[in-house]
């Protein structure tokens, strides 16, 4: 009796199973039953990444550098080229198809993370007793200066943008 | 017991004709593709044309395409060659052999089709 | 068209001995190949199919090898019944093609 259901790596056509092509080959003709599928290797910047019956490879993915985009891994006939962003850009999506400059944390905030080439800054705001006083991709809240360590004394408060203000002790005569 | 019996050779003049049978028993005919092969005296095996379980499918090498015919009556569990503008290169024993995994698992004892003028 | 080749032409051994016969294709076929026995005024018998799988009915002497181009059937120990001609057929496309065979000869 013919099959109505066919093994893992197989398909059915014609009532009868048929090998599926390996990944990073294409289908070119369906088997019969005297010949096995007929499967052809992927050409050049080509891909199929699945056990497949695909008559077409899938072109590689393109890092347009206009994107800001870069190859991070090459692909093969049985992968995708994957793609990250240039120095100083992070892509804006999971796919990366296109990517955006990173995100400078504001005076107040300081970097809580550094920007990757897939995931923006994340900035978080200075707590009491820290401050940042520039916009900057890198720069961590930094803590404020402590004036007694200097044998000095406080003479202007520092806020989350700014540093302390130090000065000498009044001396009594 | 699965068996294949070729009929029909003979003695043909080159442009003649000739019609082999190939008569199966012991299995469900109509479950299994076959194919004709063919052997030219003290030569090796040629693949000659193959045929479909229900018939809707035929295939050929290049050289016999549009000379030779393959077709199959599963009403009656038999096999044909029809083969015209024979050559003296069509010399051969012909046998039948059924697929099988796509693989020829049984075949049967071959007829002698000797093209001379 | 895949040409396969076989080789030796002739394997002239002794009953007892191992017998080692190629067949190399002309590209790719993965484990589509099958292997066939003749023996003089009789049809071929399938010996091995998808390159090494065994055959209900053949002695486990006979056992195959091999994928994509280069395929072999050994025999262990020949027997005298072993003295034939064997072929390798290809079935990854059309049209189907069988090696030119291999004689396997008493010496």
């Known amino acids: 009796e013919p099959p109505t259901a066919c093994r893992e790596k197989q398909y059915l056509i014609n009532s009868q199973c048929c090998s599926l092509c390996q990944p990073g080959q294409k289908l070119v003709s369906d088997c019969t039953e005297f010949t096995e599928t007929e499967c052809l290797p992927c050409g050049e910047s080509e891909f199929l990444d699945t056990w497949n019956r695909e008559t077409h490879c899938h072109q590689h993915k393109y890092c347009d550098p206009n994107l800001g985009l870069r190859v991070q891994q090459k692909g093969t006939s049985e992968t995708d080229t994957i793609c990250t962003c240039e120095e100083g850009w992070h892509c804006t999506s999971e796919a990366c198809e296109s990517c955006v400059l990173h995100r400078s944390c504001s005076p107040g905030f300081g970097v809580k993370q550094i920007a990757t080439g897939v995931s923006d800054t994340i900035c978080e705001p200075c707590p009491v007793g820290f401050f940042s006083n520039v916009s900057s991709a890198f720069e961590k809240c930094h803590p404020w200066t402590s004036c007694e360590t200097k044998d000095l004394v406080v003479q202007q408060a520092g806020t989350n943008k700014t540093d302390v203000v130090c000065g000498p002790q009044d001396r009594l005569r | 017991e699965v068996q294949l019996v070729e009929s029909g050779g003979g003695l043909v003049k080159p442009g003649g004709s000739l019609r082999l049978s190939c008569a199966a028993s012991g299995f469900t005919f109509s479950n299994y593709g076959i194919s004709w092969v063919r052997q030219a005296p003290g030569k090796g095996l040629e693949w000659v044309a193959s045929i479909s379980s229900g018939g809707d499918n035929t295939y050929y090498p290049d050289n016999v395409k549009g000379r030779f015919t393959i077709s199959r009556d599963n009403a009656k569990n038999s096999l044909y060659l029809q083969m015209n503008s024979l050559r003296a290169e069509d010399t051969a024993v012909y046998y039948c052999?059924?697929?099988?995994?796509?693989?020829?698992?049984?075949w049967g004892q071959g007829t002698l089709v000797t093209v001379s003028s | 068209e895949i040409v396969l080749t076989q080789s030796p032409a002739t394997l002239s051994l002794s009953p007892g001995e191992r017998a080692t016969l190629s067949c190399r294709a002309s590209?790719?076929?993965?484990?589509?190949l099958h292997w066939y026995q003749q023996k003089p005024g009789q049809a071929p018998r399938l010996l091995i199919k998808y390159a090494s799988q065994s055959i209900s009915g053949i002695p486990a002497r006979f056992s195959g090898s091999g994928s994509g181009t280069d395929f072999t059937l050994t025999i262990s120990s020949l027997e005298p019944e072993d003295f034939a001609v064997y072929f390798c057929q290809q079935f990854s496309s059309w049209p189907l093609t069988f090696g030119g065979g291999t004689k396997v000869e008493i010496k």
């Open positions: 052999a059924r697929a099988g995994e796509k693989a020829m698992d049984y």
């Open positions: 590209q790719t076929i993965n484990n589509n």
